[in-house]
């Protein structure tokens, strides 16, 4: 069964940047991914980035930088640019959209214990729908 | 898919500048990696330069320092702006769009022609 993973990670030098990196584990060819905050992405979730492999990434605030990191996973850096820090106890999401598989979400979140520099383990925490 | 109209050749004398231009017609995406090739009569086509979504530039040694490779706000816009041209420089350039960065799949112009002669 394909599963997707995702981490959270707090940069150690700059406190207000966060990177979420998600991978799609299974067979098939990555068609799309979506990544989302403060849940799924259709569910009450904000987009946050798409990553299309033939056309391209497209962003929204306060992402800075949507990648691939290789051809089955991705990364969002993000810039929280408050006094406070919402992304520590924020939800973000990702999903794949995968031929001929159809499209496969986790999330996850930074552990609240979480020292600058580390990050979460990439334990899928499935979210049970595949289109 | 992503079409790729190059504009700006034409006929320079040696020493002289060109600015050559490139627009994607997809923008709704933004296109991570963003380069002009070139081919010049019997040879094979080589990288001159690339720039990548967060302005990492790459450049072949025998440009540097002449040509300058830049996109506009849009992201899917790109120019070279080519100064101090010499008859080694005669071929035709290519727009090149890599979306992903990983070679996932490849777009390219239709190439304008560049002649540097006195």
């Known amino acids: 069964t394909p599963e997707v993973w995702v981490q959270v990670q707090m940069e150690a030098t700059e406190l207000s940047s966060f990177t979420v990196h998600c991978g799609f584990l299974g067979p098939g060819s990555i068609s799309l991914v979506t990544v989302s905050w403060g849940g799924p992405d259709g569910a009450g979730g904000t987009k946050l980035a798409v990553l299309h492999p033939e056309l391209g990434t497209r962003q929204w605030a306060p992402a800075r930088q949507a990648r691939w990191e290789t051809q089955s996973s991705i990364s969002l850096a993000l810039e929280d640019s408050g006094a406070s820090s919402p992304f520590a106890n924020t939800t973000f999401c990702c999903k794949f959209a995968s031929f001929p598989e159809g499209s496969w979400e986790s999330c996850g979140s930074l552990p609240p214990s979480s020292d600058p520099g580390l990050s979460a383990p990439p334990t899928p925490v499935p979210i049970l729908r595949a289109d | 898919e992503v079409q790729l109209v190059e504009s700006g050749g034409g006929l320079v004398q040696p020493g002289g500048s060109l600015r050559l231009s490139c627009a994607a017609s997809?923008?709704?995406?933004?296109?991570?990696?963003m380069g002009w090739y070139r081919q010049a009569p019997g040879k094979d086509r080589e990288l001159v330069a690339t720039?990548?979504?967060?302005?990492?530039?790459k450049y072949v040694d025998s440009v540097k320092g002449r040509f300058t490779i830049s996109r506009g706000d849009a992201k899917n816009s790109l120019s070279l702006q080519m100064n101090s041209l010499r008859a080694e420089d005669t071929a035709v350039y290519y727009c090149?769009?890599?979306?992903?960065?990983?070679?996932?799949?490849?777009?390219w112009g239709q190439g304008t022609m560049v002649t540097v002669s006195s």
């Open positions: 090149n769009a890599d979306p992903s960065g990983l070679g996932r799949k490849v777009y």
């Open positions: 997809e923008t709704y995406f933004d296109l991570y990696v």
């Open positions: 720039i990548t979504y967060t302005g990492s530039i």
